[in-house]
């Protein structure tokens, strides 16, 4: 419901790739996090809890991802100029109720020094 620019470092570059950091409040137990490029869903990750507090992680649009207790990182590799765009983290909260959606994002600038395979 609260939409805006990420007020943290959302993009972390390394080895010709980028880690896109999508945060969520640590009170949140069950959620879906989608990574959007423009309006297109690139990746998603859903965390649910079953009986006995068993945690289930599912992805419909799979990307290499990493989950912590307050963030989901999505990794994009082999960067080129076509990756430059607005990226958004779309968080849907299921638990605690009630259902909430919040969107935050930023622009990914691609500089020559960050490209995967530069011509020498």
């Amino acid at each position: 419901e609260i939409n805006g620019s990420a007020n943290y470092e959302m993009f972390i570059f390394h080895n010709g790739g980028v880690q896109i950091l999508c945060k969520y409040p640590d009170i949140v137990q069950q959620f879906k996090m989608q990574l959007l490029k423009g309006g297109q869903i690139l990746c998603d990750l859903t965390k649910t809890k079953g009986s006995g507090n068993t945690v289930s992680i599912k992805s419909l649009k799979f990307c290499h991802s990493q989950l912590s207790n307050n963030s989901v990182s999505f990794f994009l590799y082999n960067l080129d100029h076509s990756h430059a765009n607005y990226y958004f983290c779309n968080l849907s909260i299921f638990d605690p109720p009630p259902f909430k959606v919040t969107l935050t994002g930023g622009y990914l600038h691609i500089y020559e020094s960050q490209l995967c395979c530069q011509l020498k």
Epitope: P25, I27, L91, P96, T104
Partner: antibody
């Protein structure tokens, strides 16, 4: 002035139905989650139902399947449809605003910050 | 399911005295998600404290909240005649989404 005004209470026989309404004013109704909370005479507060800004609904076991909460944002109105009423449902019913704000980094809960004056429901033969 | 138990059920004090009301949860809850309400006879409840310790708008500073985990306290440092009422604690969570303690009645001795 921020205000919630309930209506629709009255006397109904066991097994009967009643629809409560709550008119909201003085704030952007569609931006807030809303609750119904009831209180039997001389007793404590009991949460009855909640509806999120997306229209998602929540109930405790005591009313699930019998009560239905709904909202009409265009009319700044909250409703509670009560079916299969029992004597134990007799109470004052309050319409309540829930104040919370969620960002990607924080989940702020500011409590139930606005209450209506209540409407009385009596279930008796 | 989280159950909130308030004590004492009734507290008899005189104006000017200090009141200490307790709210105990059956399992850990985050202090950010605990609130206190005051209800005077014939009136709707009103929000006093949210986030366990933050006063709601317009609430005098003689009211304070504290606690974490399973034990929470509402303190009224110096009772005024208008403070004699029933006080409820409330939590929000997953199951149930919302629950109240049974209340503490603060009466004039």
């Amino acid at each position: 002035e921020v205000q919630l005004v309930e209506s629709g209470g009255g006397l109904v026989q066991p097994g009967g139905s009643l629809r409560l309404s709550c008119a909201a004013s003085g704030f952007t109704f569609s931006s807030y989650d809303m609750h119904w909370v009831r209180q039997a005479t001389g007793k404590g507060l009991e949460w009855v139902s909640a509806i999120g800004t997306a229209g998602d609904t929540y109930y405790p076991g005591s009313v699930k399947g019998r009560f239905t909460i709904s909202r009409e944002n265009a009319k700044n109105s909250l409703y509670l449809q009560m079916n299969s009423l029992r004597a134990g449902d007799t109470a004052v019913y309050y319409c309540v605003r829930d104040n919370r704000k969620v960002t990607h980094e924080h989940y702020y809960y500011y409590g139930m910050d606005v209450w209506g004056q209540g409407t009385t429901v009596t279930v008796s033969s | 399911e989280i159950v909130l138990t308030q004590s004492p059920g009734t507290l008899s004090l005189s104006p000017g005295e200090r009141a200490t009301l307790s709210c105990r949860a059956s399992q850990n809850i985050r202090s950010s998600y605990l609130a206190w309400y005051q209800q005077k006879p014939g009136q709707a409840p009103g929000l006093l404290i949210y986030g366990a310790s933050s006063r709601a708008t317009g609430i005098p500073d003689r009211f304070s909240g504290s606690g974490s985990g399973t034990d929470f306290t509402l303190t009224i440092s110096r009772l005024e005649p208008e403070d004699f009422a029933v006080y409820y604690c409330q939590q929000f969570g997953s199951s149930p989404m919302c629950s109240f303690g049974q209340g503490t009645k603060l009466e004039i001795k």
